[in-house]
């Protein structure tokens, strides 16, 4: 019987060009975590395997960093990164638990990053 629950950061937003940490946490189970997959819709981003450790997909090795913990850091965000992300916990003996995060990448605000003009 699967008793665990996955807590995630839920719906989050970040600015284009910035970075974001995706976090999931499995609780309420004593099952052993054998692997965590991080996936974006139809693409594998990275895995953290109990034996192998962290392994980043060659498709994302320049923009993804492992951690903190079992989380994942996405860097140099673009608007194309907007979408659903999944953390998939493979556990023994429970089986698979899946968490969902929706990330929205926003255009950088002119107020923060635009040119500043002084009016004489």
């Amino acid at each position: 019987m699967m008793t665990g629950t996955i807590e995630t950061t839920g719906n989050i937003s970040a600015e284009k060009g910035g970075s974001i940490i995706l976090q999931c946490h499995l609780s309420s189970t004593t099952a052993q975590v054998t692997q965590v997959n991080w996936e974006q819709q139809d693409q594998l981003l990275a895995i953290c395997n109990a034996d192998l450790g962290w392994h980043i997909s060659p498709s994302f090795k320049d923009r993804v960093a492992p951690g903190p913990g079992l989380g994942l850091t996405l860097q140099s965000l673009t608007v194309n990164d907007t979408g659903e992300y999944f953390c998939i916990y493979h556990t023994y003996p429970d089986g698979t638990y899946t968490g969902r995060i929706f990330l929205e990448v926003l255009e950088s605000s002119v107020a923060e990053h635009g040119a500043r003009f002084q009016i004489p």
Epitope: T34, Q35, N37, E39, D42, Q43, L44, I47, N49, L52, H55, S57, P58, S59, F86, I88, H90, T96, T98
Partner: nanobody
Framework: EVQLVESGGGLVQPGGSLRLSCAAS????????MGWFRQAPGKERELVAE???????NYADSVKGRFTISADNSKNTAYLQMNSLKPEDTAVYYC??????????WGQGTLVTVSS
């Protein structure tokens, strides 16, 4: 579950070539990372090369320019073309794969011996 079957290992002279194959069957949908690791006697298992479904690759520095990884998505098979083999390439080569939402799976290993 995913099953991996490797083939193509053997004995080859220094400077020679071999081609390893790794065929995946079972739950093989979605994106994947398929790759080759190797383990020489008394040494740790190390990544040799890997490839994704869209063809992005990564190589260990020690094999760049000599080894080429490729894949046939219609057959769920990855290939490792090994050229200019050196005695230090001698090892058991293991195929590994992770498919979308699935666990990491290992092949049984195939021995590559480079010797004159």
């Amino acid at each position: 579950e995913v099953q991996l079957v490797e083939s193509g290992g053997g004995l080859v002279q220094p400077g020679g070539s071999l081609r390893l194959s790794c065929a995946a069957s079972g739950r093989t949908f979605g994106d994947y990372i398929m790759g080759w690791f190797r383990q020489a006697p008394g040494k740790e298992r190390e990544l040799v090369a890997e490839i994704t479904r869209v063809g992005n690759t990564n190589y260990a520095d020690s094999v760049k320019g000599r080894f080429t990884i490729s894949a046939d998505n219609s057959k769920n098979t990855a290939y490792l073309q090994m050229n200019s083999l050196k005695p230090e390439d001698t090892a058991v080569y293991y195929c590994a794969a992770v498919f979308s939402r699935g666990p990491l799976t290992w092949g049984q290993g195939t021995l590559v011996t480079v010797s004159s």
